[in-house]
């Protein structure tokens, strides 16, 4: 028995930040679980981890250079990524493992979300067009 995961097919990070919501076919209330977000087709880079425990606050962990936070819903975990770079445009996969109560569960691999990071373009403000020729 596997947990199904739904993700948006594509998100655009205009301001170098994005909310990626992982929706599960499973209620996470009062469960001990590990939800993670992985970058790349091979999922080789673990971007962010959210630990849920029925008795403690949510713990969020990231050590791969990503600025990450997490929020828990009844059947979802939302990863909030900030300070993204254009070269971090990639496909991102949600993953989850539920430890307690038994039985142990994990997810079917999702289709992933392509996060397209748009670079910040510095444009001259129309209020201050710069020096004009005399």
């Amino acid at each position: 028995n596997k947990i199904l995961v739904k993700q948006s097919p594509m998100l655009v990070a205009y301001d170098n930040a994005v909310n990626l919501s992982c929706k599960y076919s499973y209620n996470l209330f009062s469960r001990e679980f590990r939800a993670s977000l992985h970058k790349g087709l091979d999922s080789a880079v673990e971007v962010c981890v959210v630990y849920g425990n029925y008795s403690q606050q949510l713990q969020v962990y990231s050590k791969t250079g990503f600025n990450c936070d997490g929020k828990l819903g009844n059947e979802s975990v939302t990863f909030y990524l900030q300070n993204l770079y254009v070269n971090q445009t990639d496909i991102y996969f949600c993953k989850i493992e539920v430890m307690y109560p038994p039985p142990y569960l994990d997810n079917e691999k999702s289709n992933g979300t392509i996060i397209h990071v748009k670079g910040k373009h510095l444009c001259p403000s129309p209020l201050f067009p710069g020096p004009s020729k005399p």
């Epitope: 993670s36 999922s43 673990e46 713990q59 962990y61 050590k63 993953k95 493992e97 994990d106």
Partner: nanobody
Framework: EVQLVESGGGLVQAGGSLRLSCKAA????????MGWFRQAPGKEREFVAS????????YYEEAVKGRFTISRDNTKNTVYLQMDSLRPEDTAVYYC?????????????????WGQGTQVTVSS
Amino acid sequence: EVQLVESGGGLVQAGGSLRLSCKAAGRTFSSYAMGWFRQAPGKEREFVASIEWDGGGAYYEEAVKGRFTISRDNTKNTVYLQMDSLRPEDTAVYYCAASRWRTALTNYYDVADWGQGTQVTVSS
């Protein structure tokens, strides 16, 4: 609880190779992710590599990618770390770790049990 016994550490010259082994006894070995951490003198223990319960996926610290390879043999309850192109900065005590999870082991929160560690020294 699982008992973990490491072997294969030693002194090697820069550019050389070592193969670490970690034999597990106790808990069902094949049901959990396994991995390696290391601790250099005066530094925190850091993640090196891990492998999923069925060997289906592996994770590596950026600094060791392309040089280190983790593998496991569930019939022998053993996990291996093949270390090639060793550098002086790889000098550390290497610890085997058993995860609480089937597919995940990348940080302290994931570790259920530690081995005693084996010293790896790379001379220049």
